[in-house]
């Protein structure tokens, strides 16, 4: 299709080489098409246009994204050619940064059902640049944590070194939805709840004598509880003796609950005590079996191919540790009688 009629928007993504970060493009169809199509809920009854441009569908995922190759080749369907780019409803997610993401991206509705739809498309010219060392040293992270129940704030990474007074007007989105009342480079959260978690996007306009473009940054916000003040506790094994059958295989499970820590380095391991000797056992990898906001339960098994007489003289010890301290639980094997 002819893209000369598409509205054009220029965007700049300056990424940090120090951290992983994502980027998004919204299918910013020109008003009133966008309102009716992708963000239909932004129309108030008084704003309904005389002829609704997209009569085809109101399904939010009904847009098609293309990339325009720089060599003038035909448009390429994003989904077929770019595995690191994911389409979610009207949004294109770039999972990895890199200058190779620079280029022109076009979106338009899949269903063309009226003559007005033909020119209904938007071309986004994306320029991707690594952050220079001259940039602000203490810029806000693209991953920000908010402590549940307390006050917090979300800073726009590309503007976090500027004072509120210097800062240009910022447009914020949360999970693709415009936050129309938030206009500064920092969103103040009066009290943090779990619903504050999500993907936030901040945009501002930068201009030179020739043109203007939108500088965009994406912030992943996570709501967290305060770091635990407790060492982990062992939920299983509970008993310190275990009845076993000689010659049979045996699996002993160690399950431990670790309280939330922002920097989480849990340790869970098995070792064997035999008279004065003790050694760590090579066992299968630990696995998380339940994870909540407050804690995580991790399990690690020790597997004996067959129980021997020697095993009855040993103690099998599960050792768990976090930054606060450690806990152990030992199990002595006992032969089943009868």
């Amino acid at each position: 299709f002819n893209i000369s009629g598409c509205s054009t928007k220029k965007l700049l993504w300056t990424y940090s080489t120090r951290s992983e970060e994502e980027f998004v493009l919204f299918c910013d169809l020109p008003e009133p098409q966008k309102s009716h199509f992708c963000h239909r809920n932004r129309l108030s009854p008084k704003q309904v246009p005389e002829h609704l441009p997209f009569m085809g569908s109101n399904d939010l995922s009904d847009v098609q994204w293309y990339q325009q190759p720089s060599n003038g080749d035909p448009l390429e369907d994003i989904r077929k050619s770019y595995p690191h780019i994911i389409q979610d409803k009207c949004t294109l997610h770039f999972l990895t940064p890199g200058v190779n993401n620079s280029g022109s991206y076009i979106c338009r509705p899949k269903m063309i059902k009226s003559p007005y739809d033909v020119a209904c498309c938007v071309k986004m010219i994306l320029e991707v640049k690594p952050q220079t060392n001259a940039s602000c040293e203490y810029s806000a992270s693209h991953k920000q944590d908010l402590l549940l129940g307390s006050t917090g704030s979300i800073s726009c990474p590309s503007l976090s070194c500027q004072s509120d007074a210097q800062s240009p007007a910022v447009t914020w989105y949360k999970n693709g939805k415009l936050l129309s009342v938030e206009r500064s480079n920092r969103i103040v959260v009066d009290e943090v709840y779990d619903y504050h978690q999500g993907t936030y996007v901040c945009d501002y306009t930068q201009s030179d004598t020739v043109s203007s473009w939108t500088v965009r940054a994406v912030v992943q916000v996570r709501t967290i509880v305060g770091d635990t003040k407790l060492k982990p506790d062992i939920l299983d094994p509970v008993e310190d003796t275990l009845e076993v059958e000689l010659g049979k295989p045996l699996t002993i499970s160690c399950k431990a609950r670790f309280g939330f820590e922002r920097v989480f380095n849990p340790v869970i391991k098995w070792y064997i005590k035999d008279s004065d000797l003790e050694w760590e056992v090579s066992v299968p990898e630990a696995k998380s079996i339940k994870s909540t906001l407050k804690d995580e339960i991790i399990e690690r098994n020790i597997i004996l191919e067959k129980v021997t007489q020697r095993d009855l003289r040993r103690k099998f010890v599960c050792f768990v540790q976090n930054s606060i301290g450690n806990t152990t639980q030992s199990v002595q094997l006992k032969e089943k009688r009868g």
Epitope: H39, N41, R42, T151, L179, S180, V188, D190, E191, Y193
Partner: antibody, heavy 118, light 111 residues
Amino acid sequence: SLEESGGGLVQPEGSLTLACTASGFSFNNNYYMCWVRQAPGKGLEWVACIYTGSTGSTYYANWAKGRFTISKLSSTTVTLQMTSLTAADTATYFCARDDKVEHGYGLWGPGTLVTVSS
Amino acid sequence: DVVMTQTPASVSAAVGGTVTINCQASESIDNWLAWYQQKPGQPPKLLIYSASNLASGVSSRFEGSTSGTQFTLTISDLECADAATYYCQSTFYGVNPVPNAFGGGTEVVVK
């Protein structure tokens, strides 16, 4: 409970400060304390809110920005300063508190009448 | 600011009947919507919060529902005491749960 005070007759272009006093609870529990007005025979109109927690964030209806100022005076009193008043500001002004669980105004004062007239 | 458009302005129904009041938000507010009942000379009373949850002490004859940016309050088994003006309100502002803009109100007359 909540009680508004400070209403009365004021000249056009005049100023007035309303107060809202809480009893039975204090603002230390971090509430949104708000002002809502209702012109005679008309509907409810949101004016402003203040968060009584550490951020002290203030929120205003677009039409109220610049003319009205909401403040926390103490742990039990919130005020609304109104300037450049016109006849259109004649209304009963209610003080209301959000309910932290049932989001919305769970507690209201009886209201105070402000009349702007020469 | 979000604009809340409430319809109809007035509705009349007989005792035992049902009335439906609609409220349209100018932008997405998810489920952040409250409904109030106001009788003459009194402050409003919270009926429903988070679009469909009944406030404490409120009769189950009041029901809130939502579809996108359209919200509905249904009052069934009408009683004389239900005669009042009903208002919807957005209860979210930016990223904070600040109760703010009201709808224009709907007067319910019980015959």
